[in-house]
Amino acid sequence: VLPAKPENISCIFYYEENFTCTWSPEKEASYTWYKVKRTYSYGYKSDICSTDNSTRGNHASCSFLPPTITNPDNYTIQVEAQNADGIMKSDITYWNLDAIMKIEPPEIFSVKSVLGIKRMLQIKWIRPVLAPHSSTLKYTLRFRTINSAYWMEVNFTKEDIDRDETYNLTELQAFTEYVMTLRCAPAESMFWSGWSQEKVGTTEEEAPYGLDLWRVLKPAMVDGRRPVQLMWKKATGAPVLEKALGYNIWYFPENNTNLTETVNTTNQTHELYLGGKTYWVYVVSYNSLGESPVATLRIPALNEKTFQCIEAMQACLTQDQLVVEWQSSAPEVDTWMVEWFPDVDSEPSSFSWESVSQARNWTIQKDELKPLWCYNISVYPVLRDRVGQPYSTQAYVQEGIPSAGPVTQADSIGVKTVTITWKEIPKSKRNGFIKNYTIFYQAEDGKEFSKTVNSNILQYRLESLTRRTSYSLQVMASTNAGGTNGTKINFKTLSISHHHHHHHHHH
């Protein structure tokens, strides 16, 4: 059988290294050798490249080496496949070396900010040594912030043949570390060089970008003052490296700026004690270069009715995220504040918050939350300066079996009945939503019985027991991950009811 006709011929010119062609099929059923016929020097010269007859593996590739590679040039390439039965020739293919030239990557030697020019980095590189000296090179510059996985790209060409080349990358974030990598190709070529080694540079610092501001309203104290916990953080989109020297806070009752009070702090939280009226609070951050724009918050009067628009909320888990979605009856509300913190018996140590815009869902990576911990999640609608009624839910990113079972006791022991009471497992030991309790009980040397009840039941009366019999009993609390038994208790049913016994006694 004749060999298959060589097809899909693809050639690439590795500048000053080789000219390599590949084709299909890569393997033949019977032993096949190949001859690649080339015309070059614009068709004046011709030669061949043979695959090694001793190579019995994949040899659907052949390379022409210097000094017979000249550039610029046009080549024709034809592949002949030969086996014991004969020869099969490919079609003749035509190659312009400029269009298939691949050169070495450039070498970036500096990425620096230019004094006084904001949000710009100047990249300097050395044009590859192995590149045609007179040709225009096209470049792709890839860049990303150091903590991002997402690359951005900019394309440009350089016509000069200067060995030391530069490009000014503008519209960057202030005071941010960027990773840069560069590739190049002759302007007409379809093949790019590899990427250069990555280089890091930092844009110049500026006055702070801005703040996100939030509050927790606490119950009024006996003297009528209201504690308001203010908290702020760098606004979303602010440079990662941005450092504030401090924060200025000023606040006053609505329509009464004469009563303005000011505070300076280096913390990112501050507790204010306000009266019952509506207050306005303003916060700016500052560094050596200036102040951020003002962050504003309206604190409603104590008796103000807040609007309610969230109708329902669901928390669901994906592979690696917790997603909270909500439904709203107010289409005009498009900003929401999400609060989340662990539901613990003591005061929560970590309280987090985040603004959501133009969406009715909020997503957090599972690994940002602790497994086996219950989180309280509240969503507040925000309409201009008004904050509405929150809607809250609870969620676990991962449930486990409880760390301890319920503490149980037997009350009201009768002849054939007993009332079992157990305590809720402390929040810190639940490790998931308790979905039910199961009471396991067994007479001495008897069969074990069980009864499962809802999680809101903490007491159960067992009936149809055998009189004057010792029983062992334990209660298991279950989450979606499984159950944990509480301590085993023992009790013995009475031989005669107390009621009957007393009656008898009187006679």
Partner: antibody, heavy 117, light 112 residues
Framework: EVQLVESGGGLVQPGRSMKLSCTAS????????MAWVRQAPTKGLEWVAS????????YYRDSVKGRFTISRDNAKSTLYLQMDSLRAEDTATYYC??????????WGQGVMVTVSS | QFTLTQPKSVSGSLRSTITIPCERS????????VSWYQQHLGRPPINVIY?????PSEVSDRFSGSIDSSSNSASLTITNLQMDDEADYFC???????????FGGGTKLTVL
């Protein structure tokens, strides 16, 4: 339409010089190697000389090396053959031809050069 | 330096098939493309086969080219001979060692 038109032939005495020209049209002259091929009366074709696209590389048959010079003017789309120290055996019809893919795809009509005293 | 050897003459009757061989003296015939030219008396040559077996679009499909490694030669085959096929035929290849084109001595085809 590709056209190659030779000029400059005629009768010349042995030892003297002559310059042939070939004016090309209908294609991008600077993209092709060009050649001169001759044919002595009643004899076969004999390649004489070739020149690269930019004129930097030239090739000659041994019998004309040092006597003939091939050159080109890409701006004028013209090929030249300067023939010095002409001999009787140089008598032939000289064809201007275009190289491509290892062969000559277009030929001029030819110009006769007679070297005789 | 190799030579290409052709028979001085070949003849064939009208509408028959003839083959003109072209033998390479040294080196592999398959290492460099072979082309063929037809030359009528007093006219410049025209190319009828290039790259061993490729035919220019304006040339009749009665003309075909091939190479045979066992005899280290190329062949031009003309089928259904016509009177107008009477001409001189030259093979040509390239000598990569000395970087020059090489012509065969030519074959005179007579149509009987």
């Amino acid at each position: 339409e590709v056209q190659l038109v030779e000029s400059g032939g005629g009768l010349v005495q042995p030892g003297r010089s002559m310059k042939l020209s070939c004016t090309a049209s209908g294609f991008t002259f600077s993209n092709y190697y060009m050649a001169w091929v001759r044919q002595a009366p009643t004899k076969g074709l004999e390649w004489v000389a070739s020149i690269s696209t930019g004129g930097g590389n030239t090739y000659y048959r041994d019998s004309v090396k040092g006597r003939f010079t091939i050159s080109r003017d890409n701006a004028k789309s013209t090929l030249y053959l300067q023939m010095d120290s002409l001999r009787a055996e140089d008598t032939a019809t000289y064809y201007c031809a275009r190289h491509t893919m290892g062969y000559f795809d277009y030929w001029g009509q030819g110009v006769m050069v007679t070297v005789s005293s | 330096q190799f030579t290409l050897t052709q028979p001085k003459s070949v003849s064939g009757s009208l509408r028959s098939t003839i083959t003109i061989p072209c033998e390479r003296s040294s080196g592999d015939i398959g290492d460099n493309y072979v082309s063929w030219y037809q030359q009528h008396l007093g006219r410049p040559p025209i190319n009828v086969i290039y790259a061993d077996d490729q035919r220019p679009s304006e040339v009749s499909d009665r003309f075909s080219g091939s190479i045979d490694s066992s005899s280290n030669s190329a062949s031009l085959t003309i089928t259904n001979l016509q009177m107008d096929d009477e001409a001189d035929y030259f093979c040509q290849s390239y000598d990569g060692k000395i970087e020059i084109p090489v012509f065969g001595g030519g074959t005179k085809l007579t149509v009987l």
